[in-house]
Interface confidence: low
């Protein structure tokens, strides 16, 4: 196979957040992030190769304690395909409850043209620290 | 490609811990752990092949309940490059808050000679159960 | 190498659960789940190729809040080899404490014929939402 398509993204939001959608970025200005195959469009990741992908994400809430997290509950993170509309689906969802970090991963088939969106519902802001909040994909097989 | 460099490590510290650095081990005496490419030096993992790696870690606190975890807060785990000093950086960081286990993963470029260190700050001890605490890397592409 | 053996499974239990063992399923009727190499036998995953595998799992408790989770503590998830009996071992274990989701992953050697079981101890039920509860494996190398 050619080198597998991969991406590791850092948060690139401007605050205060006007909508629940997290915007991602990559490149030297954003730590050790990169895109190698997939592309960023307005802060969302667009897939350029069909196949099975491993998605992973970690999001840490800024200025957060167990008390903050539970008081602002429910704070939920969801990763899904947001376009094309015909393929719209939630792929991964986690709530923070009394914690300030969620992290997970999964294998899922994605198609060329799928755009991935990550939504953080609730009033808390995500941390932009490069070791606390990140989102990545890795092509695994056709 | 040749077989990808991989490692899955188990905790190998002696306690009480004098410093926050966790020491890892591998081999038949430590469950199903191994190093295949990277090497252990004084309990830290040294990379022997440039490339993009998937890091993953799970750490469970010993003798821990939600109450213990919150009373000993902040207990934080950080994984980073600790040498060479010129490349020192935190790659992955999580706090326990009211939980007793953290688990995460990420993609990050590493270079031959990079040594990875894992620091657990706080007074709680990590569990050395082989199914509760482990740290691993997998080479993904150049 | 040929395409790596992979599987991504969804929960296929019928409730109320009579025993702590979670039963998994795959295929079009269960979201974006599939088996590609390994096979399902009575809801458990059977490995058909020796090698190093990456296991990952996320389990979310249904009708759960921090209060529920702590009141029903301990709720624990364990993933292990349950047959053949001679290779029986716990590979991955997490407790929920005051959270309602656990997620983790690890690298572990598996052999052809190993059957993986996932046990959820406690009285709470897992969510069957396809973006909240899933279990997968990916062959990494021989």
């Amino acid at each position: 196979h050619p080198e597998p398509h991969t991406a590791e993204l850092q948060l690139n939001l401007t605050v205060p957040r006007k909508d629940p959608t997290l915007r991602w970025g990559a490149g030297p200005a954003l730590g050790r992030s990169f895109t190698h195959g997939p592309e960023l469009e307005e802060g969302h990741l667009r897939i350029h190769q069909d196949g099975l992908y491993r998605l992973h994400i970690q999001v840490t809430l800024a200025i957060c304690s167990s008390t903050t997290a539970s008081r602002h509950h429910p704070t939920t993170l969801a990763v899904g395909i947001c376009s094309p509309a015909s393929r719209s689906i939630s792929l991964l969802r986690l709530s923070f409850h009394q914690g300030c970090t969620i992290a997970s991963q999964r294998l899922t088939p994605l198609a060329r043209g799928d755009t991935l969106c990550t939504n953080l519902t609730g009033t808390l802001l995500p941390s932009r620290n490069t070791d606390e909040t990140f989102f990545g994909v890795q092509w695994v097989r056709p | 490609h040749p077989e990808p460099h991989t490692a899955e490590l188990q905790l190998n510290l002696t306690v009480p811990r004098k410093d926050p650095t966790l020491r890892w081990g591998a081999g038949p005496a430590l469950g199903r752990s191994f190093t295949h490419g990277p090497e252990l030096e004084e309990g830290h993992l040294r990379i022997h092949q440039d490339g993009l790696y998937r890091l993953h870690i799970q750490v469970t606190l010993a003798i821990c309940s939600s109450t213990t975890a919150s009373r000993h807060h902040p207990t934080t785990l950080a994984v980073g490059i600790c040498s060479p000093a010129s490349r020192s950086i935190s790659l992955l960081r999580l706090s326990f808050h009211q939980g007793c286990t953290i688990a995460s993963q990420r993609l990050t470029p590493l270079a031959r000679g990079d040594t990875l260190c894992t620091n657990l700050t706080g007074t709680l001890l990590p569990s050395r159960n082989t199914d509760e605490t482990f740290f691993g890397v997998q080479w993904v592409r150049p | 190498h040929p395409e790596p053996h992979t599987a991504e499974l969804q929960l296929n239990l019928t409730v109320p659960r009579k025993d702590p063992t979670l039963r998994w399923g795959a295929g079009p009727a269960l979201g974006r789940s599939f088996t590609h190499g390994p096979e399902l036998e009575e809801g458990h995953l059977r490995i058909h190729q020796d090698g190093l595998y990456r296991l990952h799992i996320q389990v979310t408790l249904a009708i759960c809040s921090s209060t529920t989770a702590s009141r029903h503590h301990p709720t624990t998830l364990a993933v292990g080899i349950c047959s053949p009996a001679s290779r029986s071992i716990s590979l991955l274990r997490l407790s929920f404490h005051q959270g309602c989701t656990i997620a983790s992953q690890r690298l572990t050697p598996l052999a052809r014929g190993d059957t993986l079981c996932t046990n959820l101890t406690g009285t709470l039920l897992p969510s069957r939402n396809t973006d909240e509860t899933f279990f997968g494996v990916q062959w990494v190398r021989p």
Partner: antibody, heavy 122, light 111 residues
């Protein structure tokens, strides 16, 4: 219900050997660290040895190091203690004890067998 | 010579309160020693009562409580009952991987 049943004790001469067994039931044996703890007649408790859940890591009290070997067979839900070069001071009731798994840096014994008596005497 | 020290014997009246202590021959006991308490009645195996200084094991009545008192770990029994008559052992975590047990305290419930 957790049950631990020891066997294999008895009278042995100094320098002799004995193998103790512990049959476990009522819990997932392969998840737990297991221990041997002994109690000399009319005395206190002494931790002897532990073995991790997979059987790959073992620790021993200094008093038995090099003479005793702990092992387990997860497929048989069994724990063993091979005792060689026995001395009079090894005379004790030997208990098989499960580590509570809270977790296992600090041995906390939440389930015990009834013990088996080992007498070392000429 | 025992590293972990306990009173050899104590007496309490039914319904009374008694505190057993567990010290180190040299140094203070702290929560980092993870004090653990076991109860043993004649001819029986020990039973776990308290771990991690003050956490009651499941099924242990709430008249048993653990704490650090000064430089020692303590087990307090309030409202003592006849079946609390037993030997009590404390265990301290001193160095990996072992625990050191105290010599035990024989508790007598008078009456």
């Amino acid at each position: 219900e957790v049950q631990l049943v020891e066997s294999g004790g008895g009278l042995v001469q100094p320098g002799g050997s004995l193998r103790l067994s512990c049959a476990a039931s009522g819990f997932t044996f392969s998840v737990y660290y297991m221990n041997w703890v002994r109690q000399a007649p009319g005395k206190g408790l002494e931790w002897v040895s532990d073995i991790n859940n997979e059987g790959g890591t073992t620790y021993y009290a200094d008093s038995v190091k090099g003479r005793f070997t702990i092992s387990r067979d997860n497929s048989k839900n069994s724990l063993y203690l091979q005792m060689n070069s026995l001395r009079a001071e090894d005379t004790a009731v030997y208990y098989c004890a499960r580590d509570a798994g809270y977790s296992n840096h600090v041995p906390i014994f939440d389930s015990w067998g009834q013990g088996t008596l080992v007498t070392v005497s000429s | 010579q025992a590293v972990v020290t306990q009173e050899p014997s104590l007496t309490v009246s039914p319904g009374g309160t008694v505190t057993l202590t567990c010290g180190l021959k040299s140094g203070s006991v702290t929560s980092d020693n993870f004090p653990t308490w076991y109860q043993q009645t004649p001819g029986q195996a020990p039973r776990l009562l308290i771990y991690n200084t003050n956490t009651r094991h499941s099924g242990v009545p709430d008249r048993f409580s653990g704490s650090i008192l000064g430089n020692k770990a303590a087990l307090t029994i309030t409202g003592a009952q006849a079946d609390d008559e037993a030997e009590y052992f404390c265990a301290l975590f001193i160095s990996n991987p072992s625990v050191e047990f105290g010599g035990g305290t024989q508790l007598t419930v008078l009456g």
